[in-house]
């Protein structure tokens, strides 16, 4: 079997064997090595010498196999845009940002660039659970039967109605989607406007 060509090697068809780790250099019509993540090209390749790579300086990075002559500057997560840091910048990875709690991504350009406050869900509803936190605005859905939620909130969850009998009490008024069951002591009389509405 033929020995594997090691960069730099000639390429007549302008393609290289390993597209991820090699690139075509048109001036010399050769395939050269890319620099691994966390490094940059400190000296370009020639027919007799492969690419020379150097480590990115502090506060800079390159995420992919590359033939860049500089490293990208690390950028902080912009709190004014509603972003917070979840992982610091390293030589191999940019700063990882996400929307602050209670916010969602409103502008996306390869990554989130701007977050906005989640909409409140009105009483009787809750925010539908999403696969990914911060991915989109709240979509409010009604409380299921037997549950209630009595605030305007981006995060409040529907709670089950109180079962009066579990507390040794009786129901004075049934619960709705927006209010809990009202319980009372079984010995207490009903208020005048409710007399006759309770089954004994």
């Amino acid at each position: 079997s033929q020995p594997q060509a090691v960069p730099p090697y000639a390429s007549e068809n302008q393609t290289c064997r390993d597209q991820e780790k090699e690139y075509y250099e048109p001036q010399h019509r050769i395939c050269c090595s890319r620099c691994p993540p966390g490094t940059y090209v400190s000296a370009k390749c020639s027919r007799i010498r492969d690419t020379v790579c150097a480590t990115c300086a502090e506060n800079s990075y390159n995420e992919h196999w590359n033939y860049l002559t500089i490293c990208q500057l690390c950028r902080p997560c912009d709190p004014v845009m509603g972003l917070e840091e979840i992982a610091p910048c390293t030589s191999k990875r940019k700063t990882q940002c996400r929307c602050q709690p209670g916010m969602f991504c409103a502008a996306w350009a390869l990554e989130c660039t701007h977050c906005e406050l989640l909409s409140d869900c009105p009483p009787g509803t809750e925010a539908e659970l999403k696969d990914e936190v911060g991915k989109g605005n709240n979509h409010c859905v009604p409380c299921k039967a037997g549950h209630f939620q009595n605030t305007s909130s981006p995060s409040a969850r529907c709670q089950p109605h109180t079962r009066c009998e579990n507390q040794g009490l009786v129901e004075a008024a049934p619960g709705t989607a927006q209010s809990d069951t009202t319980c009372k002591n079984p010995l207490e009389p009903l208020p005048p406007e409710m007399s006759g509405t309770m089954l004994m």
Partner: antibody, heavy 128, light 107 residues
Framework: EVQLLESGGGLVQPGGSLRLSCAAA????????MTWVRQAPGKGLEWVSL????????YYADSVKGRFTISRDTSKNTLYLQMNSLRAEDTAVYYC?????????????????????WGQGTTVTVSS | DIQMTQSPSSLSASVGDRVTITCRAS??????LNWYQQKPGKAPKSLIY???SLQSGVPSRFSGSGSGTDFTLTISSLQPEDFANYYC?????????FGQGTNLEIK
């Protein structure tokens, strides 16, 4: 023009199954909750089931809970109602309907405003 | 569950009459009340949402009012095409429920 077209109704024996479909057109199907309502012969309207736009949240009337399943396929703009363990009392015309969302409402909640568009209905008869 | 009660169950009226149908909820439902019209053999048609807001394309002779537990649908001047069944529906608390219907017929 917003259109809803139900299909899949028919005659089925008690205990049998049926799947109703509702093809939607003329609106962004993936943005709206959808509802099934039924009407037994000579009777009034009965709310059956509701599904959120994502399909992640579903609701059922007690009379069908555990037997019926509502679902949606956004790629096909279609709403479904899978009906199992059918009973004589499930005999009805089944309507699919699009939930209404008024333009002037600030808080995005599509559920409080009823439905604004109805399909023509499909008849389900459960009989031996 | 919230019960919806319509009255009257049936009603005879003449073209040009002013007609009122009422709907009562067993609990406070704020203004989450909708009205629908249905003609025999046809699908329902949406008339009013949020107790008093007219659906697009519905004639202005239809109006709705009320809040809490008591609601009304008013037709200011009956037209021949208005003879039909009318249903109210609450969308305050799951399960959403309909009234039993009001049959509006020609006198």
């Amino acid at each position: 023009e917003v259109q809803l077209l139900e299909s899949g109704g028919g005659l089925v024996q008690p205990g049998g199954s049926l799947r109703l479909s509702c093809a939607a057109a003329g609106f962004t199907f993936s943005s709206y909750p959808m509802t099934w309502v039924r009407q037994a012969p000579g009777k009034g309207l009965e709310w059956v089931s509701l599904i959120s736009p994502s399909g992640a949240t579903t609701y059922y009337a007690d009379s069908v809970k555990g037997r019926f399943t509502i679902s949606r396929d956004t790629s096909k703009n279609t709403l479904y109602l899978q009906m199992n363990s059918l009973r004589a009392e499930d005999t009805a015309v089944y309507y699919c309907a699009k939930n209404h969302y008024p333009d002037d409402v600030i808080i995005k909640n599509y559920y409080f405003y009823g439905v604004d568009v109805w399909g023509q209905g499909t008849t389900v008869t459960v009989s031996s | 569950d919230i019960q919806m009660t319509q009255s009257p169950s049936s009603l005879s009226a003449s073209v040009g009459d002013r007609v009122t149908i009422t709907c009562r909820a067993s609990q406070d439902i704020s203004n989450y009340l909708n009205w629908y019209q249905q003609k025999p053999g046809k699908a329902p048609k949406s008339l009013i949402y949020a107790a008093s807001s007219l659906q697009s394309g519905v004639p202005s002779r239809f109006s709705g009012s009320g809040s809490g537990t008591d609601f009304t649908l008013t037709i200011s001047s009956l037209q021949p095409e208005d003879f039909a069944n009318y249903y109210c529906q609450q969308t305050h608390t799951i399960p959403y429920s309909f009234g039993q219907g009001t049959n509006l017929e020609i006198k």
